[in-house]
């Protein structure tokens, strides 16, 4: 039969494993031919059995409050036969109770605020602990409160957990206190469990301190190159108060030059000295200003602490900066007529060194083959200019200090090339004209137009004429439409393809410039074999494409 005693496991055993007891069959002679098995809820997880010996181990920490007993089943098998040696049997493992639940403060974290200098006896906060143990099980859940940390400023009532002030406190000496309260069960008897909680007690502030500058003199520097709005340094006052009571405002009390301002950084409570106007080392190299600081909020009843605002003196040194050359103008525009000879005067730029030493200036033109500049800033041409190639030049003129070639300034210079009438008008396109053999007199052969590359202040006006030779013996005539176009008309009836397959007509085109320019343009007219309706059937001529020649007179 089975051999075992009643099994008990104390709850909350901290070891990895606890030997509960041994199940064995009285048929087991120790030759290792029996195998013990454990079944049921908790087998293999909470309890294991050494299959070789029948020893039962608890491998988990047990909590009686969660489960007070385990009902398991035991089997023993003969390994050699695979048969049960004993009938499967049910057995109980009881979890024995201990005072294993310490008092717990369920509402933590605790935090309380009381005004500084509050009188003794002032109620701060009440803390309450609870104990999960059975209140009816002796004194397991009967609690007593005590103060572990916080004397002599605080006290706790042993049975209620009420914390009171027992000594006046000054926030400026210490602004918060950690009070540690212990709750013990078993009404503090031996074997009691305890729980602690921390209570953060903060002293609220009153505005009884004014801000005071850390320094009576601040020395700051500002570069003369600094733009307006630049922060040139910070000044700092300290206030023993906190929060709203320590918020402060900085201001200028004295600045004859009206050059500086002070703004308050409300996050850091610093005063930031700001440049209100640009400074110039050559004009004034140091300044002296006075600043003051006040609390932002002051209670009326505490005004006595804030009568005299703290002030400080700020000396500001202007740092000399080697400034680049300064041009008289931000940009220059010059004009010059096209076709003026090389070396012609365009204009003069001028830059000076703003620093005290007044370095001589050297000028240069960035990447220009057309213009030159000398050390006096005089710009001249290096080539004759053609407006029709470029009507504007965008130059970059650089001024460099002779004493410090790293000090450079550049400005744009725009040169406009003015027009002169140096181009004659010419055909606007290549014209290919045809006339039928059977054409009548006065038939329109071609409408022509002209272009002129010169700039026109007013509108261009072109005049069209046949050359003198063509006027005297021409088979064609021209009519000027007075709108910068003209038409070519036949001047006779009938043409002969065999005798004269091609006509070359010289057309003179003049402009309205001063002086007027004229060009001769050749119009090629092919004679075509046309049907009665006058439409072209075949145009036979030796050269299918003739380039139109023109020259300027």
């Amino acid at each position: 039969g089975w051999v075992w005693n009643q099994f008990f496991v104390p709850e909350e055993m901290n070891t990895t494993s606890h030997h509960v007891g041994r199940l064995r069959s009285d048929l087991d002679n120790g030759n290792n031919s029996f195998q013990y098995k454990l079944l049921g809820a908790g087998a293999g997880s909470t309890f294991i059995i050494d299959e070789r010996t029948g020893d039962i181990y608890a491998i988990e920490k047990l909590d009686r409050e969660e489960r007070s007993l385990y009902i398991l089943r035991a089997q023993v098998i003969d390994i050699t036969t695979g048969r049960a040696v004993e009938p499967e049997s049910e057995f109980v493992i009881k979890v024995s109770d201990i005072n294993d639940n310490e008092p717990k403060f369920l509402d933590e974290p605790y935090e309380a605020i009381v005004p500084e200098m509050s009188p003794e006896g002032t109620l701060v906060i009440q803390v309450t602990a609870s104990d999960a143990d059975d209140p009816s099980s002796g004194n397991n859940a009967r609690l007593l409160y005590s103060l572990l940390q916080g004397q002599p400023y605080f006290s706790v009532e042993p049975t209620t957990g009420v914390i009171r002030i027992s000594s006046k406190m000054d926030r400026e000496l210490q602004d918060e206190y950690w009070v540690i309260i212990q709750a013990k069960d078993m009404i503090g008897q031996p074997g009691a469990l305890s729980g602690t909680t921390s209570v953060l007690i903060k002293l609220s502030d009153v505005n009884d301190n004014k801000p005071i500058f850390k320094e009576s003199l601040y020395r700051l520097t500002v570069s003369e190159s600094a733009p307006t709005g630049t922060s040139i340094g910070t000044i700092m006052a300290y206030d023993n108060d906190i929060g709203e009571n320590a918020e402060m405002d900085y201001s200028i009390e004295e600045d004859d030059s009206q050059t500086f301002d002070i703004i308050t950084n409300h996050e850091t409570q610093e005063g930031i000295v700001i440049l209100k106007k640009k400074v110039n080392f050559e004009h004034q190299n140091h300044y002296g200003i006075r600043a003051k600081v006040k609390n932002h909020h002051v209670d009326k009843q505490l005004m006595k602490y804030h009568t005299e605002a703290s002030t400080t003196f700020i000396k500001i040194q202007v740092e000399d900066v080697d400034e680049p050359p300064l041009f008289l103008l931000p940009y220059y525009i010059f004009e010059i007529f096209e076709e003026t000879p090389q070396g012609s005067f365009v204009g003069v730029v001028s830059a000076t060194d703003p620093d005290n030493r007044k370095s001589p200036i050297r000028y240069s033109i960035t990447r220009s083959k057309v213009f030159n500049i000398d050390d006096n800033g005089t710009i001249t041409t290096t080539n004759s200019l053609d407006r029709e190639i470029s009507a504007w030049y965008n130059l970059s003129i650089t001024a460099t200090e002779k004493y410090n070639i790293e000090q450079i300034s550049s400005i744009p210079v725009y040169v406009q090339v003015l027009n002169i009438n140096d181009h004659a008008p010419e055909f606007s396109q290549y014209y290919e004209s045809y006339v039928c053999e059977n054409a009548g007199s006065g038939q329109v052969i071609q409408t022509i137009s002209a272009v002129d590359r010169d700039e026109s202040i007013e509108e261009h006006h072109f005049y069209f004429n046949l050359s003198v030779e063509d006027t005297n013996s021409s088979s064609f005539t021209i009519i000027d439409n007075q709108d910068n176009t003209a038409v070519i008309l036949t001047n006779r009836t009938g043409f002969n393809l065999q005798e004269e397959p091609i006509f070359y007509i010289s057309i003179l085109i003049a402009d309205n410039g001063i002086p007027s320019l004229t060009s001769t343009n050749t119009l090629t007219i092919h004679v075509c074999d046309c049907d009665d309706s006058g439409s072209t059937q075949t145009c036979q001529y030796q050269e299918l494409m003739l380039s139109m020649g023109f020259k300027t007179e």
Epitope: T15, T16, S17, H19, N32, I48, D50, E51, R52, T53, D55, Y57, I59, I79
Partner: antibody, heavy 120, light 111 residues
Framework: QVQLVQSGAEVKKPGASVKVSCKVS????????IHWVRQAPGQGLEWMGI????????SYAQKFQGRVTMTRDTSTSTVFMELSSLRSEDTAVYYC?????????????WGQGTLVTVSS | QSALTQPPSATGTPGQRVTISCSGS????????VNWYKQLPGTAPKVLIY???QRPSGVPDRFSGSKSGTSASLAISGLQSEDESDYYC???????????FGGGTKLTVLG
């Protein structure tokens, strides 16, 4: 009955490797851990490591980490322990032992031991 | 240097009671079961006591084990000549994550 039978004695040169086998019978091979323990001449017992035959997971003593490898062959119910980079101080009797179903349960059966001599 | 400390030797006369101590630390004996092994010369060790105080079948009740804190002890009462052997304590060590043995105690039975 439960038996753990180990391979025969070995003589090895320093720097060489040795592989000792442990063939088990009389129980389900995968049900119990196998530990390896060695004993230098005239010295005490020293645990080397453990293998779980069901999962091939191993745990080695820090001292042997990197030098020892434990393997198993389920078809022959045999566990192997290989020790490499042998030195003279590895001369010892090497035992395999059966442990319980938890790491911390005692060793109830031991092999007869294998003497490994490391000598140049 | 063994993790568990045993006296290297112990002596007794037949019928006498002898105790062998084994001391360790909180990571081994302090938090795990102690086992005792007996080893006769030229043979493999055999389990004598497991789980602090449990005897396997076949081990006479003259042998008993106990544990207190970080120390354990093996007591042999009614000493007999066949008890002359080497005795080793062993336990699992949580820090080393492995088994540790004592250096062994050679028990001599006089007389």
């Amino acid at each position: 009955q439960v038996q753990l039978v180990q391979s025969g004695a070995e003589v090895k040169k320093p720097g060489a490797s040795v592989k000792v086998s442990c063939k088990v019978s009389g129980y389900t091979f995968t049900s119990y851990f196998i530990h390896w323990v060695r004993q230098a001449p005239g010295q005490g017992l020293e645990w080397m490591g453990i293998i779980n035959p069901i999962s091939v997971s191993t745990s080695y003593a820090q001292k042997f980490q990197g030098r020892v490898t434990m393997t198993r062959d389920t078809s022959t119910s045999t566990v192997f322990m290989e020790l490499s980079s042998l030195r003279s101080e590895d001369t010892a009797v090497y035992y395999c032992a059966r442990g319980g179903i938890q790491l911390w349960l005692h060793f109830d059966y031991w092999g007869q031991g294998t003497l490994v001599t490391v000598s140049s | 240097q063994s993790a568990l400390t045993q006296p290297p030797s112990a002596t007794g006369t037949p019928g006498q009671r002898v105790t062998i101590s084994c001391s360790g630390s909180s990571s081994n004996i302090g938090s795990n079961f102690v086992n005792w092994y007996k080893q006769l010369p030229g043979t493999a060790p055999k389990v004598l006591i497991y789980t602090n105080n449990q005897r396997p079948s076949g081990v006479p009740d003259r042998f008993s084990g106990s544990k207190s804190g970080t120390s354990a002890s093996l007591a042999i009462s009614g000493l007999q000549s066949e008890d002359e052997s080497d005795y080793y304590c062993a336990t699992w060590d949580d820090s080393l994550n492995g088994w540790v043995f004592g250096g062994g105690t050679k028990l001599t039975v006089l007389g």
